[in-house]
Interface confidence: medium
């Protein structure tokens, strides 16, 4: 049984997709697409602010962890990368770039350094780090 | 500028995609799509033969590494996972499930155990392992 007709404008032909298969995206070219979210890992080391600016310039934001189920690919990510989580000293909370507060039990926060920014590490860990320290970073774009 | 009209049959409406964005796939539901290849990481530990059978049952194969550029997402994979690489004792070569020989300089083969199967480890390393040892595994499906 086939469904989901995809109009491929490049070749102007119909491609048939089995019910169990689907397209993912849309995402920026050569980004990773998973459960209709787009991710890209950047090798160059930048501080948190530069990393944020780099993601924004690509119409994305630094990684936001919102669901262990929908983002289970993050379990297997090696090393440490800036994500969009910052510490608000006034109330002691951790919040994402969009202003939302970090949900309980999503990340294990580990105080590696003194700082107000957080690195993502495998198995849903967040390592506190000084925001001016250069690190690799993960950009994310949520599809509509 | 917008292009690539996508016919969304679910809502029967047109979604416009910017030129710099694209859909990836098709892939099995909830698989990772990257540069039009589909990947899935399986948590349950199986031996190499069971892992191969699991991938085949999903119309896929165990991971084949064919390009550091097209598969650079594999750089950051944590831990060790079965891939579709086996040792042919008669001629000493390493070959993929499809019969093709491992290209030089794609993987650094490290003999950590006695065996004729290989685990994928981050940064394009292959760890030799006994084929009957249970490990997690990576399935891959190349899109047409």
């Amino acid at each position: 049984i086939w469904s989901a007709v995809f109009l491929n404008s490049l070749f102007n032909q119909e491609v048939q997709i089995p019910l169990t298969e689907s397209y993912c995206g849309p995402c920026p070219k050569n980004w990773i697409c998973y459960k209709n979210n787009c991710y890209q890992f950047f090798d160059e080391s930048k501080n948190w602010y530069e990393s944020q600016a780099s993601c924004m310039s690509q119409n994305a934001s630094l990684l936001k962890v919102y669901s262990k189920e929908d983002q289970d690919l993050l379990k297997l990510v090696k090393s440490y990368h800036w994500m969009g989580l910052v510490h608000i000293p006034t109330n002691g909370s951790w919040q994402w770039e969009d202003g939302s507060i970090l949900s309980p039990n999503l990340l294990t926060i580990i105080e590696m350094q003194k700082g107000d920014c957080a690195l993502y590490a495998s198995s849903f860990k967040g390592y506190i780090e000084n925001c001016s320290t250069p690190n690799t970073y993960i950009c994310m774009q949520r599809t509509v | 500028i917008w292009s690539a009209v996508f016919l969304n049959s679910l809502f029967n409406q047109e979604v416009q995609i910017p030129l710099t964005e694209s859909y990836c796939g098709p892939c099995p539901k909830n698989w990772i799509c990257y540069k039009n290849n589909c990947y899935q990481f399986f948590d349950e530990s199986k031996n190499w033969y069971e892992s191969q059978a699991s991938c085949m049952s999903q119309n896929a194969s165990l991971l084949k590494v064919y390009s550091k550029e097209d598969q650079d997402l594999l750089k950051l994979v944590k831990s060790y996972h079965w891939m579709g690489l086996v040792h042919i004792p008669t001629n000493g070569s390493w070959q993929w499930e499809d019969g093709s020989i491992l290209s030089p300089n794609l993987l650094t083969i490290i003999e950590m155990q006695k065996g004729d199967c290989a685990l994928y480890a981050s940064s394009f390393k292959g760890y030799i392992e006994n084929c009957s040892t249970p490990n997690t595994y990576i399935c891959m499906q190349r899109t047409v």
Epitope: - | T108, I110, M112, K114, A121
Partner: antibody, heavy 123, light 107 residues
């Protein structure tokens, strides 16, 4: 001739972070297959592997200590640095760095070890 | 976590053979290395890949590994062989694992 030498504080207070440096000579940590590992040994007890860094900057950690450890390398200075956070008196040990042979078939062996540095954790 | 179990101590007379065992689940499927550590000194690799000796290690040191047990054998044991000995293996879950250690006493 391959040599390695560990350096760092001999005394750290509980909850502090330990930083150890391994300075080596006789090999390059950019040669394919090569790695440098850290192993510790509490007084009168067995060896315990902590971490390893490969030539390609791939890092491996003991699963039980992974959240506390960071290993880095400076190829130009021929140095490998291990940091261990939240030190506790049970972390009192001699800390060794060791060269992981570049021979593929001897992949699990540490063929040359440093002299070790004793670290005491006490307030 | 993998566990490699060694006898705490082995006693041997000079010139006799000392055998040190290292036990672990399906250890014969893995490569085993052995290290010698004399008091106040760093460990020295004496056997790697079950049976191979690094250059400079005397021929009296040999290794074997099958089933669940690896064995380090010192033939014609000398007083200079008095030391602690550790086996070591690797697996994809625990990575580099050392044995519990065996003290060899040459009587």
């Amino acid at each position: 001739q391959v040599t390695l030498k560990e350096s760092g504080p001999t005394l750290v207070k509980p909850t502090q972070t330990l930083t150890l440096t391994c300075t080596f000579s006789g090999f390059s940590l950019s040669t394919s297959g090569v790695g440098v590992g850290w192993i510790r040994q509490p007084p009168g007890k067995a060896l315990e592997w902590l971490a390893l860094i490969y030539w390609d900057d791939d890092k491996r950690y003991s699963p039980s200590l992974e959240s506390r450890l960071t290993i880095t390398k400076d190829t130009s200075k021929n140095q490998v640095v291990l940091t261990m956070t939240n030190m506790d008196p049970v972390d009192t040990a001699t800390y060794y760095c060791a060269h992981r042979t570049g021979i593929a078939v001897a992949g699990i062996a540490f063929d040359i070890w440093g002299q070790g540095t004793m670290v005491t954790v006490s307030s | 976590q993998s566990v490699l179990t060694q006898p705490p101590s082995v006693s041997v007379s000079p010139g006799q053979t000392a055998s040190i065992t290292c036990s672990g689940d399906k250890l014969g499927d893995k490569y085993v290395s052995w290290y010698q550590q004399k008091p106040g000194q760093s460990p020295v690799l004496v056997i790697y890949q079950d049976t191979k000796r690094p250059s400079g290690i005397p021929e009296r040191f040999s290794g074997s590994n099958s089933g669940n047990t690896a064995t380090l054998t010192i033939s014609g044991t000398q007083t200079v062989d008095e030391a602690d000995y550790y086996c070591q293996a690797w697996d994809s879950s625990s990575l580099y694992v050392f044995g519990t250690g065996t003290k060899v006493t040459v009587l």
